[in-house]
Structures are given as structure tokens and as C-alpha cells.
Interface confidence: low
């Protein structure tokens, strides 16, 4: 027989025994070109002196063999005498040490037995009813396949699974989706309905994130407000990196978790845009306003849980940066202006009602006036800050009011609304003898003292009713008592107290009469 042909004679050895643990196994045969074929197998056991024979039986019952010597691979053409269009049965007989060992048989149609490729190119991954769906284009001329997958997590080894039979131009597989860990998948294919055919190699890794992106464990700190009215938000602790299976380490598209920072400016609600989302790497500058900051984690399946922090407002107040003048037509505020064409947001809120919504007004873009001041006015009818109570006023500025991260704080201060002059008048003025020529004057704190920085001082006025002489005594805003000395016994005096602000003189309290009794000696 010629070596290139299958020899239709009895092989040169005795019958085969298939019961041995050693011997030939894992025979696979397939077409490698339009007219070329290849069979290969494994041999278990010592190889010295072993001769291999590839046996083939046609459907007619005629059998032949190829002698391959010590080789465990054979290539032959469609002219070798083996019917490639009809079903044939193939096996290997290995002869060694006067005994023959036989492999399991493979029955197939050689022409249709193509060496299958694994899924190639782009494998699309999506979520379907709590499972993972993978989809890919069927390799050219390979429609009709059995597909397997294997998968592992960072803490588990490979596990094998079946995708079931595929018979279309696109193939797909439903696989388990892990809730909290990343997975690596690989796929392989073989010809459908051809148990004897060999599996393709495994595909490149497909890296799949957990269904739930990890909760971002980060910490923020916020710097003090700078002279420009802005403070920097800094990340104290980076989010922990997702643990990845071995094949997904390095640049592994598909498992990336992206973290985004969502800023919500709580102050100044009347501005155009209250929320902004930006990458976590871009830590923004903030105004002194109150913010909610959320870190949102997301992966290819969408957003996951977020973590939210509250950044309180910077309550540091500037002394007398704000001027308020009250006229018959209404009230005007003045403050040092920022650059040309700046939009200001003026926000006020009664002190002690921080939970309620602040009143907010947005100015049209304005330029500084000749004195370098910016202004905001309102009429008495509007009722703005009309009640006699303490208001917290904050003014923010931005040249780009729609850009949330470009707002800055101009000032933060307090103002007493309504008729502060009258409302601030001290009450419950009382006079007590202190010594033979002095008295102690006490009063209840002015309502203005509830407003930080508003009350500049108290003034106590004492009038001698005999001579009509008047003396005035300034008192620190934190004090509500003063001692009047050098008084004369038997003379009638009146005492009054008023509370002054930086821009407003208060109204005197009701006059309180007193005199020091003349001491009669025994």
C-alpha cells in the first residue's frame, strides 16, 4: 500500500484490546482545507516502540488503515480512499510490546467535520432577567454548533457550563450573573451533532462586572472658604478597586467601575441649575453654600448604590460687608461688587428656621456702580424681610450662573428686619441702689442681640432732672448692666437705654425715674 492512501488490507498485527487504561484516546478528525483532512489523538503510556495505525471503516463495511509510526497526527487528502462525503467510523490501534490497544471510535462525515473556531471578535454582554446574556457573530461557514462556557470569580476556580445547541448566524449563551463579584468567562464551540469532533480553543476572556457595582467607600474633606469665596472639596479616601479574576487583570474592558460625583447645591434654589455631575477625578471648588454630594458607582449594567454626604454651609460671617438703607420707597442693599456682568443670588432666611425654604432672588447680570458696589432693592409692599426678626443673609456670585461649580460666596451676614429701631428697644429697665452715690441699671437683652453682629452697642442715658444735665454711657453688646456713679442724694434722675446697630440708631426705652435717699445720721 502507498503511504498516502488508506490500505485496504489486514493490519500487520493481532486483534486490539480496548480495556486498557493506557493507549490511544481523544481522537479527533476534521477538514483542514477544501480537500485536506487531519486526524490527531493522544497516547497514554510509555511511547518507546509504539506504532500507531489509524483505522477507518466505510459504510459498506470495508475497512482500511494508515500506518503513522510513532506520530499521533496524520494528514490525508480526499483521494486517499476514505469516503469523505459519507459516514465513516475511525479509531486508532496502537501496537506495542506484542499487544494492541484501541481508542474509542469516532463516527462522522469527514467533509462536514470542520475544525471549529471559538467565538471571535466582539462578544456583546447584556443582562436578561437576572442572568447574563452573551451574543456573538457565528464564525464564517460554521453555523450549527454546540457551545460551552467556563467562568470563574477572583475566589473560585473555573466552572464549566453548557450554552446549548446554536443554529443561526448569531449565537448566544445565558450564563449566571454574580451580584457582587466580577467574573471572567471563556467560550468554546464544536460542530453540532458530532460528538466525535473536537472542541475549539477557548475564546479570549470576557470580563463581566458584578450586577451591583460596589458601594463607593470614600471620604471627603472641605477646605476653609478662601478670600475668593470658594473652598476646595478634596477626596480623603479613594474608592476601593474591584477585585478581578486573573484573566481580567490589566486593561479589561467590561469590568470597569466608573465613579461620578453628583453635586447638589442646596442654597440659592432660585438659580438656573441646582445639580451637576462630574468625574470623581475632577474635585471641584464650591462656594460656602450647603451641598449634598453623592458618589455614584456604575458599570456596564448601569448605576449602582450611591453614598451621599452633606456639606454644611460655611457660616463664617464678614463684618459690615453689607450696607442696608431703608427709605420711604423701600430697602436697598449694597455690597462690594465682583467683576463686570456678574449675577448675584441673594438668599435670606429667618434665624431658627433653617429647615424651611429660604427666600431667594437672582439679579440680572450687573456691573459695579461708580463706588464699586453692587445693589439689590425691594419695595416695602413686597414684604421682604419685613417682619421684626433676625434674618441670615447670604449673597453668592457667578459670572456663569448655569455652571454650578463656578458660584462663590460674596458675603454671609445677619440683618434685623422690619422697624429694627423700635423692635430693638431694650425693655424691663430697672435701677437698684448700689452705694451712697451710685446705682446699678439692668435691662433685658434687645431683640437685636439675637442677630449675630447686628447689635453694635447699648447706650445708657442719665438725666439730672434738677440741672437737666445729661450723660451717656456706651455699653458692650454682650452686657445688659451698667453702674452709674457720682450721683447726688435727694436729686431725681431719669434713665433710658437704647440699642444701636452699625447703620441705625435705636429708640430710647421708656424713661425710668429714680433718686438716692438722703441718709439721716443718728
Amino acid at each position: 500500500c502507498r503511504t498516502s492512501e488508506c490500505c485496504f488490507q489486514d493490519p500487520p498485527y493481532s486483534d486490539a484490546d480496548s480495556g486498557s487504561a493506557s493507549g490511544p484516546r481523544d481522537l479527533s478528525c476534521y477538514r483542514i482545507s477544501s480537500a485536506g483532512y487531519e486526524c490527531s489523538w493522544q497516547y497514554e503510556g510509555p511511547t518507546a516502540g509504539v506504532s500507531h495505525f489509524l483505522r477507518c471503516c466505510l459504510s459498506s463495511g470495508r475497512c482500511c488503515y494508515f500506518a503513522t509510526g510513532s506520530a499521533t497526527r496524520l494528514q490525508f487528502s480526499d483521494q486517499a480512499g476514505v469516503s469523505v462525503l459519507h459516514t465513516v467510523t475511525l479509531w486508532v490501534e496502537s501496537w506495542a510490546r506484542n499487544r494492541t490497544e484501541k481508542s474509542p471510535e469516532v463516527t462522522l462525515q469527514l467533509y462536514k467535520s470542520v475544525k471549529y473556531k471559538p467565538p471571535l471578535g466582539d462578544i456583546k454582554v447584556s443582562k436578561l432577567a437576572g442572568q447574563l446574556r452573551m451574543e456573538w457573530e457565528t464564525p464564517d461557514n460554521q453555523v450549527g454548533a454546540e457551545v460551552q462556557f467556563r467562568h470563574r470569580t477572583p475566589s473560585s476556580s473555573w466552572k464549566l457550563g453548557d450554552c446549548g445547541p446554536q443554529d443561526d448566524d448569531t449565537e448566544s449563551c445565558l450564563c449566571p450573573l454574580e451580584m457582587n463579584v466580577a467574573q471572567e468567562f471563556q467560550l468554546r464551540r464544536r460542530r453540532l451533532g458530532s460528538q466525535g469532533s473536537s472542541w475549539s480553543k477557548w475564546s479570549s476572556p470576557v470580563c463581566v462586572p458584578p450586577e451591583n457595582p460596589p458601594q463607593p467607600q470614600v471620604r471627603f474633606s472641605v477646605e476653609q472658604l478662601g478670600r475668593d469665596g470658594r473652598r476646595r472639596l478634596t477626596l480623603k479616601e479613594q474608592p476601593t478597586q474591584l477585585e478581578l479574576p486573573e484573566g481580567c487583570q490589566g486593561p479589561a474592558p467590561g469590568v470597569e467601575v466608573t465613579y461620578q460625583l453628583q453635586l447638589h447645591m442646596l442654597s440659592c434654589p432660585c438659580k438656573a441649575k441646582a445639580t451637576r455631575t462630574l468625574p470623581l477625578e475632577k474635585m471641584p471648588y464650591l462656594s460656602g453654600a450647603a451641598y449634598n454630594v453623592a458618589v455614584i458607582s456604575s458599570n456596564r449594567f448601569g448605576p449602582g448604590p450611591n453614598q451621599t454626604w452633606h456639606i454644611p454651609a460655611d457660616t463664617h460671617t464678614e463684618p459690615v460687608a453689607l450696607n442696608i438703607s431703608v427709605g420711604t420707597n423701600g430697602t436697598t442693599m449694597y455690597w462690594p461688587a465682583r467683576a463686570q456682568s456678574t449675577t448675584y443670588c441673594i438668599e435670606w432666611q429667618p434665624v431658627g428656621q433653617e429647615g424651611s425654604l429660604a427666600t431667594c432672588n437672582l439679579t440680572a447680570p450687573q456691573d459695579p456702580d461708580p463706588a464699586g458696589m453692587a445693589t439689590y432693592s425691594w419695595s416695602r409692599e413686597s414684604g421682604a424681610m419685613g417682619q421684626e426678626k433676625c434674618y441670615h443673609i447670604t449673597i453668592f456670585a457667578s459670572a456663569h450662573p448655569k455652571k454650578l461649580t463656578l458660584w462663590s460666596t460674596v458675603l454671609s451676614t445677619y440683618h434685623f428686619g422690619g422697624n429694627a429701631s423700635a423692635a430693638g428697644t431694650p425693655h424691663h429697665v430697672s435701677v437698684k441702689n448700689h452705694s451712697l452715690d451710685s446705682v446699678s441699671v439692668d435691662w433685658a437683652p434687645s431683640l437685636l442681640s439675637t442677630c449675630p453682629g447686628v447689635l453694635k452697642e447699648y447706650v445708657v442715658r442719665c438725666r439730672d432732672e434738677d440741672s437737666n444735665q445729661v450723660s451717656e454711657h456706651p455699653v458692650q453688646p454682650t452686657e445688659t448692666q451698667v453702674t452709674l456713679s457720682d450721683l447726688r442724694a435727694g436729686v431725681a434722675y431719669t434713665v433710658q437705654v437704647r440699642a444701636d446697630t452699625a447703620w441705625l440708631r435705636g429708640a430710647w426705652s421708656q424713661p425710668q425715674r429714680f433718686s438716692i435717699k438722703v441718709q439721716v445720721s443718728d
Epitope: 467556563r150 475566589s155 466552572k159 464549566l160 477557548w202 486573573e246
Partner: antibody, heavy 118, light 107 residues
């Protein structure tokens, strides 16, 4: 056929390092993970870790972290396991084992006896 | 780590006997369990993978069953060449762990 052939026996002093090799043949070396398993005299089997011969990626058992290094040379289809800071209780036969397509160890090397003695 | 226990630790049997060895995992490992045979001075050889699948070339007298935490290896008719130590191993979680072994010797 698949064969995993080890380097010869080694005698080492405590504190030294040993490097054992495992030469693979009969299959495509880079297609299958290689694991290392040791067996102390008269004792059971203990898994040490694996190497992916294709990428060089490794996964070590916690017990050996910091002392074991697994490498490979694909040009000669050989995997290596180096164990440092040897102690007397590291005396064992060290086997390489191939992880098959079904994830289990389908072929084992005959092992290398490493004796640690002062 | 997942603990694997085997029982019995040793057994004596005669040729032709049916032998059963059990293996228990400290937590569920699905069917990621293998059985190995080891003879003195030799490397282990694979008998069963995925709890019940026979490794290529292994005679059908060996069979495996079980899932979750409890597994069994059965030798239907013990032959002289089967006297050896048998180990179970889980390969679902790292680190992979082996049972302590069951030694089968001649009665």
C-alpha cells in the same frame, strides 16, 4: 501523550531557597494552567497555587504568599516553582499538576523530593 | 478555607469486595469535587472529576456520586491493583483543598 517531567531531588539548608522545574510535553503548554501541590512524607496533599503559562499570571495559597514564586518559560514548555526561606517542615515531594478543560487536575508530574535539613 | 473530611481513614478489604469511601465538605461546593488514587512512591492519578465523571482511561468499576457537601467514591469490585490511598479534592474555592486520604489495604 501528556507528560510532566520534574527536575531531580534537592537537599537544602534552612533559610535557603529551592527552585523546582516541571517540563511539559504532549500538549500545547500555554493552553492549560499549571498547579503545584506538595506532599510531606507520610502526609496528605497540599495545594500551593497555579500559574497561567500563557499570561504568566499567578494565584498563590495564602499560606505560601511571600515565599513562593511561580514562573514559566514558554520556549521550553517548562514551569518553575521557587520556595524561599525554607524550614524543616517544607520537606516534601513537590508535584506539578495540569488543570484540564474541566478544571480538575488531569495529569500529575512524578514529583521532586526537597529535603530541608541542617 | 473549606475543610474536607474523609471516612473511613483506612479500611481492609478483599479482592472482589465492593468498597465505598465518603468525603464531606465544610460548605457547599456544588459538584466541583475530584477523586485521586495514589500508590506509594507515585504521583496521584485522576479517577473522577465533577463528582461523578470518569476520567479518560479509568475503568468503569470506579464511580462517584454526590453534590453540595456529601460525596461518595465506589469501587464495585476491588482488584489487586486498587490497593492504594484515595483522596478527594474540592476545586470550587481557593485555596483548593484535599481530604486527608483513605488507605485501602488487603484484608
Amino acid at each position: 501523550q501528556v507528560q510532566l517531567v520534574h527536575s531531580g531531588p534537592e537537599v537544602k539548608k534552612p533559610g535557603a531557597s529551592v527552585k523546582v522545574s516541571c517540563k511539559a510535553s504532549g500538549y500545547t503548554f500555554t493552553d492549560y494552567y499549571m498547579h503545584w501541590v506538595r506532599q510531606a512524607p507520610g502526609q496528605g496533599l497540599e495545594w500551593m497555587g497555579w500559574i497561567n503559562p500563557d499570561s504568566g499570571g499567578t494565584n498563590y495559597a495564602q499560606k505560601f504568599q511571600g515565599r513562593v514564586t511561580m514562573t514559566r518559560d514558554t520556549s521550553i514548555s517548562t514551569a518553575y516553582m521557587e520556595l524561599s526561606r525554607l524550614r524543616s517542615d517544607d520537606t516534601a515531594v513537590y508535584h506539578c499538576a495540569r488543570e484540564g478543560a474541566t478544571s480538575n487536575f488531569d495529569y500529575w508530574g512524578q514529583g521532586t523530593l526537597v529535603t530541608v535539613s541542617s | 478555607d473549606i475543610q474536607m473530611t474523609q471516612s473511613p481513614s483506612s479500611l481492609s478489604a478483599s479482592v472482589g469486595d465492593r468498597v465505598t469511601i465518603t468525603c464531606r465538605a465544610s460548605q457547599g461546593i456544588s459538584n466541583y469535587l475530584a477523586w485521586f488514587q495514589q500508590k506509594p512512591g507515585k504521583a496521584p492519578t485522576s479517577l473522577i472529576y465533577a463528582a461523578s465523571n470518569l476520567q479518560g482511561g479509568v475503568p468503569s468499576k470506579f464511580s462517584g456520586s454526590g453534590s453540595g457537601t456529601d460525596f461518595t467514591l465506589t469501587i464495585s469490585s476491588l482488584q489487586p491493583e486498587d490497593f492504594a490511598t484515595y483522596y478527594c479534592q474540592q476545586y470550587r474555592y481557593y485555596p483548593f483543598t484535599f481530604g486527608p486520604g483513605t488507605k485501602v489495604d488487603i484484608k
